[in-house]
């Protein structure tokens, strides 16, 4: 239904607190360099304006679209060109082109320092002095570093952050309470960020149809008792919500997400038996709970999929006359039977089915041609199953850090042209798949591993797109989203790469490494490992093990020495010489 004032409508629906949070996220995602104070001033102005429109929808400018109102605010910022360069050119455009222009200037890897968590006491003091400002800073800092973070979900994480601080800041040992809890929130939020980026990439590159297919598969796995018409309705709604958030329409997105949660809770009987616990929660928690809901039990009496999609004489008629609906039904039926498959795999199977019908329905005897299609799925299913098996075995053998290093070597060999920081980040994230997925029951491993890897590889593609350096990476990233992971897995050592010359300074370390937190120490070592591989792409596992073992001993020895600086200065060159020799 149309509203006289869009902004008043959203303010009333969302309430002041969520409205302000979402406006802050929107501004922080568009203008990622602006300080919090500048954004919060704009948020307050927008909120005050929204309140005037709530009081009188006919007031001046209240009929303007939210994009127009937000864009005008951003474009009125003094020194916009000084701070943002060509982004300021967007301001010369009219809506909707202006918003499109802002979206194109979102930076997935902004030049911002890593977010440093303050020390526990200081954190509690500033939280207790002004919780609203403290949580506002959290939204701002996360949103500017992750310009595609799913806004209503970020509000949920801010709520979690609030809960942790409220609980832990009354404890005597604040740090012991805060650290593990905030680490857990951070870990979940970072995974949420890469997953959402993948959804926005899907929407941007392949459009709504591709995203809706993803949603149909996911919903069918979760709600196998829901009928196809119900799944289609949910998938259509989820597609609309994600399109809005990816497009910067955060108020509409959050409002529609709350509406969808309401609908699902009102229609549990036709969706899933597992929803009740979620439906008793407040809005943000309810939506989050529904998004993470466990799979409903598969109906006991599902017939073979062959009866509908292989044995029926009308297969080609359905394919010819109602292609999307027929393929959607196939995806629904296959997905509801296979919660143990990744969404990527299910979409590959649907694509294979589509290609088979495209070919067979043009032939003389279609049923004979497509009669073996289900058997032809077997290699497509075996490939990711083998990937999970071999990688989880390797993870169990090496542990997380060792597994990350193995992945780092593998990916540096595949794409040595990619910058070392990008390779290290990707390998660390890819390596976490072990901890995240390999400990799960067998039936949950494949979907966990493959869908997580796909999201991490999407991040690699997004960063690589900004400065393309590897033809192989470009090739894998340019293809279909669901083929990316198999494409990367199939890459071998890049034979075209001319090894980097050995630079001693790359492997020169100082005593400052000793005081670094464990994570930073690991990153330093992994940076050195990537550089070694770039120097010797064909180094054997044993050679790399020797050099890295030697390096670890060197760091350990010098960090324990009385005169650390002297140790690093004298032992360092010896290490470099030994390493060169070991790799010769």
């Amino acid at each position: 239904e149309a509203h006289k004032s869009e902004i008043a409508h959203r303010f009333k629906d969302l309430g002041e607190q969520h409205f302000k949070g979402l406006v802050l996220i929107a501004f922080s995602q568009y203008l990622q360099k602006c300080p919090y104070e500048e954004h919060i001033k704009l948020v307050q102005e927008v909120t005050d304006f929204a309140k005037t429109c709530v009081a009188d929808e006919n007031a001046e400018n209240c009929d303007k679209s939210i994009h127009t109102l937000f864009g005008d605010k951003l474009c009125a910022i003094p020194k916009l060109r000084d701070n943002y360069g060509e982004l300021a050119d967007c301001c010369a455009k009219q809506e909707p082109e202006r918003n499109e222009c802002f979206l194109q200037h979102k930076d997935d890897n902004p030049n911002l320092p890593p977010f440093q968590r303050p020390e526990a006491e200081a954190m509690c003091t500033s939280f207790q002095e002004n919780p609203t400002s403290f949580l506002g800073h959290y939204l701002h800092e996360v949103a500017r570093r992750h310009p595609y973070f799913y806004a209503p979900e970020l509000l949920y994480y801010a709520e979690k952050y609030n809960e942790v601080l409220t609980q832990c800041c009354t404890e005597s040992d604040k740090a012991a309470c805060l650290t593990p809890k905030l680490d857990a929130v951070k870990e979940k939020a970072l995974v949420a960020a890469v997953r959402q980026r993948m959804k926005c990439s899907s929407m941007q590159r392949f459009g709504e149809r591709a995203f809706k297919a993803w949603a149909v598969a996911r919903m069918s796995q979760r709600f196998p008792n829901a009928e196809f018409a119900e799944i289609t309705k949910l998938a259509t709604d989820v597609t609309k919500i994600n399109k809005e958030c990816c497009h910067g329409d955060l108020l509409e997105c959050a409002d529609d997400r709350a509406e969808l949660a309401k609908y699902m809770c009102e229609n549990q009987a036709t969706i899933s038996s597992k929803l009740q616990a979620c439906c008793d929660k407040p809005v943000l928690q309810k939506s989050q709970c529904l998004a993470e809901i466990e799979h409903d039990n598969i109906p006991a009496d599902l017939p073979s999929i062959a009866a509908d999609f292989v044995e029926d004489k009308e297969v080609c008629k359905n394919y010819a006359e109602a292609k999307d609906v027929f393929l959607g039904t196939f995806l629904y039926e296959y997905s509801r039977r296979h919660p143990d498959y990744s969404v990527s795999l299910l979409l590959r199977l649907a694509k294979k089915y589509e290609a088979t019908l495209e070919k067979c329905c043009a032939e003389g005897d279609p049923p004979a041609c497509y009669g073996t299609v289900l058997a032809e799925f077997q290699p497509l299913v075996e490939e990711p199953k083998n990937l999970v098996k071999t990688n989880c075995e390797l993870y169990e053998k090496l542990g997380e850090y060792g597994f990350q290093n193995a992945v780092l070597v593998r990916y540096t060999q595949k794409a040595p042209q990619v910058s070392t920081p990008t390779l290290v980040e990707a390998a660390r994230n890819l390596g976490r798949v072990g901890t995240k997925c390999c400990t799960l029951p067998e039936a949950q491993r494949l979907p966990c591993v493959e869908d997580y890897l796909s999201a991490i590889l999407n991040r690699l593609c997004v960063l690589h797109e900004k400065t393309p350096v590897s033809e192989k990476v470009t090739k894998c990233c340019s293809g279909s989203l669901v083929e990316r992971r198999p494409c990367f897995s199939a890459l071998t050592v890049d034979e075209t790469y001319v090894p980097k010359e050995f630079k001693a300074e790359t492997f020169t370390f100082h005593s400052d490494i000793c005081t670094l937190p464990d994570k930073e120490k690991q990153i330093k070592k992994q940076t050195a490992l990537a550089e070694l591989v770039k120097h010797k792409p064909k180094a054997t596992e044993d050679q790399l093990k020797t050099v890295m073992g030697d390096f670890a001993q060197f760091v350990d020895k010098c960090c324990k020495a009385a005169d650390k600086d002297n140790c690093f200065a004298t032992e360092g060159p010896n290490l470099v010489a030994r390493s060169k020799e070991a790799l010769a």
Epitope: E227, D308, D312, N318
Partner: nanobody
Framework: EVQLLESGGGLVQPGGSLRLSCAAS????????VAWFRQAPGKEREFVAG????????YYADSVKGRFTISRDNSKNTLYLQMNSLRPEDTAVYYC???????????????????WGQGTLVTVSS
Amino acid sequence: EVQLLESGGGLVQPGGSLRLSCAASYRYIDETAVAWFRQAPGKEREFVAGIGGGVDITYYADSVKGRFTISRDNSKNTLYLQMNSLRPEDTAVYYCAARPGRPLITSKVADLYPYWGQGTLVTVSS
């Protein structure tokens, strides 16, 4: 729950016409494919015709092509089967059947259809 109720059967002479109706009550009926099956005495139920839900697509058994026409009126939640040029071999109990939430007829195997009307008898005889 899906409820289907057929009407319009009766006695008709060879070459004559009949129009069967099937009234449906179900939330997603306009998005669901519905089929007509028939069962002659001592024979298996066989597929006669079907129509897509939300999709303009119709299906017919070879034996009725060109003589029978299936249609639907979503505003009335009703499915129709217009039967012309009737023959004695068309004599049977005609049933309306649905597979919930399925927009297409992807199978004509009667066992896959969970919802059926009680049937209406059509007798073609002189």
